[in-house]
Amino acid sequence: TGADTEAVVCVGTACYTAHSGKLSAAEAQNHCNQNGGNLATVKSKEEAQHVQRVLAQLLRREAALTARMSKFWIGLQREKGKCLDPSLPLKGFSWVGGGEDTPYSNWHKELRNSCISKRCVSLLLDLSQPLLPSRLPKWSEGPCGSPGSPGSNIEGFVCKFSFKGMCRPLALGGPGQVTYTTPFQTTSSSLEAVPFASAANVACGEGDKDETQSHYFLCKEKAPDVFDWGSSGPLCVSPKYGCNFNNGGCHQDCFEGGDGSFLCGCRPGFRLLDDLVTCASRNPCSSSPCRGGATCVLGPHGKNYTCRCPQGYQLDSSQLDCVDVDECQDSPCAQECVNTPGGFRCECWVGYEPGGPGEGACQDVDECALGRSPCAQGCTNTDGSFHCSCEEGYVLAGEDGTQCQDVDECVGPGGPLCDSLCFNTQGSFHCGCLPGWVLAPNGVSCTMGPVSLGPPSGPPDEEDKGEKEGSTVPRAATASPTRGPEGTPKATPTTSRPSLSSDAPITSAPLKMLAPSGSPGVWREPSIHHATAASGPQEPAGGDSSVATQNNDGTDGQK
């Protein structure tokens, strides 16, 4: 099946043609391409309206399309292997004729997530609804079809042909027929604008009654961006009608002579062009030559004009269009500069906030300020950041390094600090000794005391507590107490000896723990250290550190 009936709309510098026919997207593109065009782009709301107009024209000619929901291919496609990209307005699709991606889109529904298959876009028309400018055809994506299998509901396609410029339609001053033949092989007798290089065939007369005269014209570029037919005066003029037929073919005023002849004229402020039919404004700004928000400013004596841009924009190379000035090129900001349409804005890096002397300046955020500190203990503000610190006996913890955690000096790196028993406390530690040993004045070592199997000596008084630094006591290995039969901790049986020479073996009698002074009902389980171990720190021997035991005073203690 080929492409059948066609409709055409020309506007600006492009013509759109609509064709009915069940073709694959590739066949449709080939059809457009043979005549020098491509499947149509729909890059703006305005262009969508032009395409809608040509489709409406086609639908008026078509008796009945086979599907209520009809689809017409346009030139938006995604090649095989290119994935859907939800972050882009065109979702990873691109226009077949090339050109930049534009922000306008009108997707019918969420797109199918795929990469392998080539995907093509069609305009979805609900033929049960009138085509209204406010209800533009939606974009529907799907497989691109294949010869003989165009895809579901495909009824045709829309082509677009671009030109250097357009001629005005020829004006007839009397009965006759104009037939335009465009470079894309479409013939039409009614075009709002006629593309460059089109031919016009004018047959004057009223059919059988008069002899018909034929004229042939070509739309040419007379001067840069000036296109006309090279004809002078109205065509098919007839003394019989004078100015009464189609205003004599004149653009504005028609003046009749006594002999039935007539001339075209123009209203004040306009002048007659070389075709002796068309009027153009004497004010060069009246044709709105400036684009993109540019204002047209008349030159001296109203002869020429210049375009002026609003603040934050500058003229492009054509001197007709405004483009955004990238103010960030001049580094106006202290830290980050973000260019915006018609301006810019300054932003500050993380850890800084707007402020300080000068425009776009940034000042350090004091994260350690009162009521703002993220740190559990110490907080030091730095330029653009901060860091947390902990008091002696604590180390930084937490994923973000803002929390402080007690250092258990009894199991610390490099081995324990006590020669024998070690009691960890919040931010510190105390040493103790096994039965028969007493704590030396340094608060760390144990010396031989009177032989006894009583309880271990408790922690020293505050002034005797173990120093965190500068200890000369050898590092000892750790063996945590294990759970006894009644839930009481017991020392792991061993024949190792404390570092001070002695022949008295350490017994495996259960140890009753003394509470540290000043906290009678609360105690910490000691770690038992044997300084004779040569291998350095070892893994704890599976102790359960959350055991509650009966204290000497009969109260329940808990770690």
């Epitope: 994935c83 997530n113 795929s114």
Partner: antibody, heavy 120, light 108 residues
């Protein structure tokens, strides 16, 4: 929820062919592409190819030099991967996988794997 | 085809450690198309991070990713025992999709 259930382990002779199936459930089968990835013992992951069940279009890794064919049966929501002219180098676990609602080929759903042993 | 080189090929770390794996591409890869997977022995790979830095559903926040162009990084902020696995990066910038060589992570 999306589930991909693969056929059982296979033992094949060199030169033979193997056809592994992957039955999908929990979504509209034609909505997502299906891909196949294999892993030889102690080795990394190797993409073999994929198929779009809506169109039947395929994309294959050229390393398989025309030995692989991927097909789908939309009536049973099943994808198939056939590998021909097997050698011992094809001994691997074969996975079917797709990217569900994620974009950019981030493979979110995986079958449990099918072990294929090629041995004489 | 784009070759992804992971380093190190294996590493041993302690529970609580910060672990970083690097994935280098033989030519530039769009950050949208770079993903990370975890594979435990005898199991199918599991998507952890998609499009360089987005956490897949149900993945703990200790996993993160960053990078652009030809250099991408995967990080575990505080290693947990259950993180013992092999980690793979994967890219797509035209067929074939390719995976990195893998990084085997062990606990000290």
């Amino acid at each position: 929820q999306v589930q991909l259930v693969q056929s059982g382990a296979e033992v094949k002779k060199p030169g033979a062919s193997v056809k592994v199936s992957c039955k999908a459930s929990g979504y509209t089968f034609t909505d997502y592409e299906m891909h196949w990835v294999r892993q030889a013992p102690g080795q990394g992951l190797e993409w073999m190819g994929g198929i779009d069940p809506e169109t039947g279009d395929t994309a294959y890794n050229q390393n398989f030099k025309g030995r692989v064919t991927m097909t789908t049966d939309t009536s049973t929501s099943t994808a198939y991967m056939e590998l021909r002219s097997l050698t011992s180098d094809d001994t691997a676990v074969y996975y079917c996988t797709n990217y569900g609602n994620l974009y950019y080929y981030a493979m979110d759903y995986w079958g449990q794997g099918t072990s294929v042993t090629v041995s004489s | 085809e784009i070759v992804l080189t992971q380093s190190p090929s294996s590493l041993s770390a302690s529970v609580g450690d910060r672990v970083t794996i690097t994935c280098r591409a033989s030519s530039s890869v769009s950050s949208s198309y770079l993903h990370w997977y975890q594979q435990k022995p005898g199991k199918a790979p599991k998507l952890l991070i998609y499009s360089t830095s987005n956490l897949a559903f149900g993945v703990p926040s200790r996993f993160s990713g960053s990078g652009s162009g030809t250099s991408y990084t995967f990080t575990i902020s505080s290693l947990q025992p259950e993180d013992i696995a092999t980690y793979y990066c994967q890219q797509y910038s035209g067929y074939p999709l390719t995976f990195g060589s893998g990084t085997k992570l062990e606990i000290k």
